[in-house]
Amino acid sequence: EEELQVIQPDKSVLVAAGETATLRCTATSLIPVGPIQWFRGAGPGRELIYNQKEGHFPRVTTVSDLTKRNNMDFSIRIGNITPADAGTYYCVKFRKGSPDDVEFKSGAGTELSVRAKPSAPVVSGPAARATPQHTVSFTCESHGFSPRDITLKWFKNGNELSDFQTNVDPVGESVSYSIHSTAKVVLTREDVHSQVICEVAHVTLQGDPLRGTANLSETIRVPPTLEVTQQPVRAENQVNVTCQVRKFYPQRLQLTWLENGNVSRTETASTVTENKDGTYNWMSWLLVNVSAHRDDVKLTCQVEHDGQPAVSKSHDLKVSAHPKEQGSNTAAENTGSNERNIY
């Protein structure tokens, strides 16, 4: 009779993560008597995958009933495949021996490759806000994919970016891989509503790439412009001075009025108006009783925006002359007001 052969008909098997892999193996003879075992890898470090008589293998089932007297089908199924299961699997026939069974013949091996989807890309921006014209870095990370080939693109508001660097790790063979990319983005004043998108394409995604986004509203700081104007007389000896705070973001803003360098009033921006580009405007009024002053008054509007050093704008109020209109509110959208009397 011809000597037993162990046949593994599939040189390779490709399985998606989470699915079941079927590894086929048949023997050409019932002799010699002895069990079949499955291993991953070869040599002394090989890993036992299945032993039909002994050991615990909860993920493995046999395709046929190995207890049937004339069974020569030793195929197995491995459930819930992960990238860690990738490797070459050998079906090995043992003959009964004493004290231990002796390896008799091995199949040629079946290479199991696992396709695993990348995780959803996570985009993170700089820790601190930056102002327009500055360049900021965004990172994008995705993990756990296999095979290694992957494509990553960056977009800002739908426009593809070119200034980025990407690494796929590890460089050598691995059960799964990770991608890390850093893109440089130049901020503009119009970026409050902008989005940065990281797009990852992989064979497991069937042409439907994964995207991760970051809103530039979390990254940008648009400093305000200030304008202090004197309004027409409201009543005898009273002058209304406004401080218009324009085009700022984020909303966190504190305004202080100073009369001749002395703090007169401090308030926090509340009823702001939003511009189309996402920035805010705000206006504060100060009612000054001119008769309370003998000399000219220097009024200063001081603004602290988003924890940054204060910026200020001053206006000189002449007391000697009869108060008259010295300016007007020309910005139609500046309707927010905070009126206080100072006596």
Epitope: E47, E54, P99
Partner: antibody, heavy 114, light 108 residues
């Protein structure tokens, strides 16, 4: 549900023999080996041997080679452990264990005493 | 035969404490064939960890196993009262199959 039901406690005189049984249910009896393990009071575990119910092939721990005989009756899905020439050293709990090492019988207490 | 030596033979641990039990083999054992069991008084042993590092069904995630060659360990990341038991390592890499002498783990 997989179950290994072992025979009840035994009190035996020194020099005698005893045959312990282990009846399997809930799985194909010929699928895997059946092992026997000894545990003396407050001691560790000792592997006695195993049998392949499919063909009756046995392997023993050399220490128990002359003490233990493992057999099976596939018609009743039962494995047996026969212990001979009993001494006080054989006083122990004996477990039958399915080849997957997950399923253990409840144990049979053997007391050897005159 | 492969002799398995467990240490310590007995130990106490406080709740929340990290515990490591070791098992040394007299000759190399392939990691696929190294198992651990938990046994409580009056009960049969339960398979606890198989193939060195895989937790058996129902075993809490605070348990882990590691090792290769002749050195293996079972670790409890944060000891709980219900973990008080005896733990045995076991090899079925070669005949005769052998067990370690066990570690009795008590709660302080």
């Amino acid at each position: 549900e997989v179950q290994l039901q072992q025979s009840g406690a035994e009190l035996v005189k020194p020099g005698a023999s005893v045959k312990l049984s282990c009846t399997a249910s809930g799985f194909n009896f010929e699928d895997t080996y059946m092992h026997w393990v000894k545990q003396r009071p407050d001691q560790g575990l000792e592997w006695i041997g195993r049998i392949d119910p499919a063909d009756g092939d046995t392997k023993y721990n050399p220490k128990f080679q002359d003490k233990a005989t493992i057999t099976v009756d596939t018609s009743s899905n039962t494995a047996y452990l026969q212990l001979s020439s009993l001494t006080s050293e054989d006083t122990a709990v004996y477990y039958c264990v399915r080849g997957n090492y997950v399923n253990w019988g409840q144990g049979t207490t053997l007391t050897v005493s005159s | 035969q492969i002799v398995l030596i467990q240490s310590p033979a007995i130990m106490s641990a406080s709740p929340g404490e990290r515990v490591t039990l070791t098992c040394r083999a007299s000759s190399s054992v392939s990691s696929s064939y190294l198992y651990w069991y938990q046994q409580k008084p009056g009960s049969s042993p339960k398979l606890w960890i198989y193939s060195t590092s895989n937790l058996a069904s129902g075993v809490p995630a605070r348990f882990s196993g590691s090792g290769s060659g002749t050195s293996y360990s079972l670790t409890i990341s944060s000891m709980e009262a219900e973990d008080a038991a005896s733990y045995f390592c076991h090899q079925w890499y070669s005949y005769p199959r052998t067990f370690g002498g066990g570690t009795k783990l008590e709660i302080k």
